[in-house]
Interface confidence: medium
Amino acid sequence: MPLLLLLPLLWAGALAMDPNFWLQVQESVTVQEGLCVLVPCTFFHPIPYYDKNSPVHGYWFREGAIISRDSPVATNKLDQEVQEETQGRFRLLGDPSRNNCSLSIVDARRRDNGSYFFRMERGSTKYSYKSPQLSVHVTDLTHRPKILIPGTLEPGHSKNLTCSVSWACEQGTPPIFSWLSAAPTSLGPRTTHSSVLIITPRPQDHGTNLTCQVKFAGAGVTTERTIQLNVTYVPQNPTTGIFPGDGSGKQETRAGVVHGAIGGAGVTALLALCLCLIFFIVKTHRRKAARTAVGRNDTHPTTGSASPKHQKKSKLHGPTETSSCSGAAPTVEMDEELHYASLNFHGMNPSKDTSTEYSEVRTQ
């Protein structure tokens, strides 16, 4: 994946100091915490007669640095010390001998905020380009993982759930994936930017929370996404059911009341009984389900319970908090940030006048 350039390029050429030494670089770049950015940069300098065969060294310094005293944040000079806090994260990616001063920043941290200037040295030709400087802005990590559920979840059938952070960059420290779920699970393979969870759901796992947590250790920042599992009950008679799927294989989510009212002349008492039974089972077992951390895709496993925020139990209940089967829709109460998966039974179309909004679990 290409490095993220999160601001339009604001190019500037330095002509104020010495028109023979000039540099083109965007004056401002914004990067989200934990992510990375490549800042294109070109500089020019005349090569005097006495330095034509000398190697070119480039340096990026923090604004206000004193060249003779302070270390650069990045350089191509092998024996030059760099700032400890930027070591391995800031790289002079460009080749100064080709007039390229491009700077790469990975695992961006809050303290990277600030302005930086470039300096070139070629033999006895030395110049600090004090204008334009590069201003780096590190903002909150607002990107969140995507959780992909292929097809529908059925009790007793294993499915591979994928948590991906496609917006992360290849060059950074690989993130640490953690999964939190009450359902029986095991860890599948992982790539740099995704982790697979193998889940074998039970009927009582319907409506329980599943969280994918991604930690960018290089910057010490974490992001997560939580969904509610939609475990679909498939009866013995495949022609009988409620809410047939649209065949898209998408895991649907909805907020608010899940409509489960029964209607239509063709609906039998058996179906109503079936729905009532399922509701009762879910209600009973749901309260017993405790959310547990099922695994981390990293090389540094950690122990300890999930945070208090993650220990909240979600409730699935009817309007009167009884187990009566009146046909009234059960409601879903969750943290505001959660995405809600619908009760999605096979066999019957929902009423057309529903005002419930749908959104895919595969969100931004």
């Epitope: 010495d18 005349p46 005097p48 006495y50 006895s124 030709t125």
Partner: antibody
Framework: QVQLVQSGAEVKKPGASVKISCKAS????????YHWVRQAPGQGLEWIGF????????GYAQKFQHRATLTVDNSTSTAYMELSSLRSEDTAVYYC??????????WGQGTLLTVSS | DIQMTQSPSSLSASVGDRVTITCRAS??????????MHWYQQKPGKAPKLLIK???NLESGVPSRFSGSGSGTDFTLTISSLQPEDLATYYC?????????FGQGTKLEIK
């Protein structure tokens, strides 16, 4: 302001040596190169050589390789040119000039050297 | 060594005239980004003064009637509208390699 002030006129006999000074002020002396250029009466400009104070690098025109010696005293921000084995054809105005990189942006006022028996 | 040949050696022009002085190097003094050619003005009894650096860059404080052009081996100094104070000798100089060398000069007189 930037200034290069050279020592006064010199009259020397053939075979002698002369040392001309060029005192800089108004900027950081060691950030620049110092060149020496001479101009014989009614003639054009002739480059002698240069010195870079920060690392002592020097360069000379082949004609002056063995007769000219360029030095600096960083403590007094002064550049020097010593020319030995003087001949009558060395009679000229000698200029010191400051160079950031390639071109000469400031020049001294010149020092007239007369070599005569 | 790189030889620099200026032409003409001298010229006389009237105030307001457009004046062109050329300088030819015995080998190219241009790289991809820069041409290592500079122009100086020397008035009688004075030290030379930088006019143009890197073939076409006007030194700060120099009147805009002066301009420079060229690359490779052929370079030109132009005075778009000659003024009385432009009476001087003009020199080109390369900085491609050691030794640095100057052209022999072009003496400009005012008619």
């Amino acid at each position: 302001q930037v200034q290069l002030v050279q020592s006064g006129a010199e009259v020397k006999k053939p075979g002698a040596s002369v040392k001309i000074s060029c005192k800089a002020s108004g900027y950081t002396f060691t950030d620049y190169n110092y060149h020496w250029v001479r101009q014989a009466p009614g003639q054009g400009l002739e480059w002698i050589g240069f010195i870079y104070p920060s690392n002592g690098i020097t360069g000379y025109a082949q004609k002056f390789q063995h007769r000219a010696t360029l030095t600096v005293d960083n403590s007094t921000s002064t550049a020097y040119m010593e020319l030995s084995s003087l001949r009558s054809e060395d009679t000229a105005v000698y200029y010191c000039a400051r160079s950031d990189v390639d071109y000469f942006d400031y020049w001294g006022q010149g020092t007239l050297l007369t070599v005569s028996s | 060594d790189i030889q620099m040949t200026q032409s003409p050696s001298s010229l006389s022009a009237s105030v307001g005239d457009r004046v062109t002085i050329t300088c030819r190097a015995s080998q190219s003094v241009s790289a991809s980004t820069y041409s290592y050619m500079h122009w100086y003005q020397q008035k009688p009894g004075k030290a030379p003064k930088l006019l143009i650096k890197y073939a076409s860059n006007l030194e700060s404080g120099v009147p805009s009637r002066f301009s420079g052009s060229g690359s490779g081996t052929d370079f030109t100094l132009t005075i778009s509208s000659l003024q009385p104070e432009d009476l001087a000798t003009y020199y080109c100089q390369h900085s491609w390699e050691i030794p640095l060398t100057f052209g022999q000069g072009t003496k400009l007189e005012i008619k």
